[in-house]
């Protein structure tokens, strides 16, 4: 019998230092580019190899970014969110939401999958 798929949602503060090639990730989302249905939030779509985010190791593809340097990312156009990151300075604080897939099988069997966005 197959168990149902649930999600464990956690939040984390990630402090990145901008590297020679920047922060090293891509985003999707925004009020004009909804990536998740009925959610205009900003999501990490790519972590670039050897970039600042990849070297730090905590930010994951599929994470939702809630704020940048304390500034909320709710209800932003996609390009406005991009510009916010580009102008965020050398030290960048990200509040992120990780979504971990949890497979709930028969009693006593609980496995964890990869984060999914």
């Amino acid at each position: 019998m197959n168990g149902r798929v649930d999600y464990l949602v956690t939040e984390e503060e990630i402090n990145l230092t901008r590297g020679p090639s920047g922060l090293g990730f891509n985003i999707v989302g925004g009020t004009d580019q909804q990536y998740v249905s009925n959610d205009s939030g900003i999501y990490v779509s790519r972590i670039k190899e050897n970039g600042a985010a990849a070297l730090d190791g905590r930010l994951q593809e599929g994470d939702k970014i809630l704020s940048v340097n304390g500034q909320d990312l709710k209800n932003l156009l996609h390009q406005d969110a991009v510009d916010l990151f580009r102008n965020a300075g050398y030290a960048v604080s990200l509040r992120v939401q990780h979504r971990l897939q949890v497979q709930n099988g028969p009693i006593g069997h609980r496995g964890e999958g990869d984060p999914s966005g």
Partner: nanobody, 128 residues
């Protein structure tokens, strides 16, 4: 981690057609930029065609324009390369590639235009 499995390669006569498919799994397909690359005997791997995550932007190698068409089906987590009017010089191993799409938070101009993070094993196309 993204897993990519190509299919549809084979032996075809010059002027014929093939349709390559690449099935992706491991993360939401709808956020992935996808590409087809090829490696001809004794040559470097070249980009053939790419399609962005939203499906509204494509790129083609000059020598395949008008003959090859890249498309995607997000419901099936699959990208296709329709190859018509095949020529002997199209003989190569064809690779599917993927990367997260979207906008770089770093620069308007991203130097890694054809940098992809995930690769399939390749499928052989031979045009006689």
């Amino acid at each position: 981690e993204v897993q990519l499995v190509e299919s549809g390669g084979g032996l075809v006569q010059a002027g014929g057609s093939l349709r390559l498919s690449c099935a992706a799994s491991g993360r939401p397909f709808s956020s992935l930029d996808m590409g087809w690359f090829r490696q001809r005997p004794g040559k470097e791997r070249d980009v053939v065609a790419t399609i962005n995550w939203t499906g509204d932007s494509t790129y083609y190698l000059d020598s395949v324009k008008g003959r090859f068409t890249i498309s995607r089906d997000n419901a099936k987590n699959t990208v296709f390369l329709q190859m018509n009017s095949l020529k002997p010089e199209d003989t190569a191993v064809y690779y599917c590639a993927a990367r997260g799409g979207g906008s770089s938070v770093d620069s308007e101009y991203d130097a890694g235009e054809f940098e992809y993070d995930y690769w399939g094993q390749g499928t052989q196309v031979t045009v006689s």
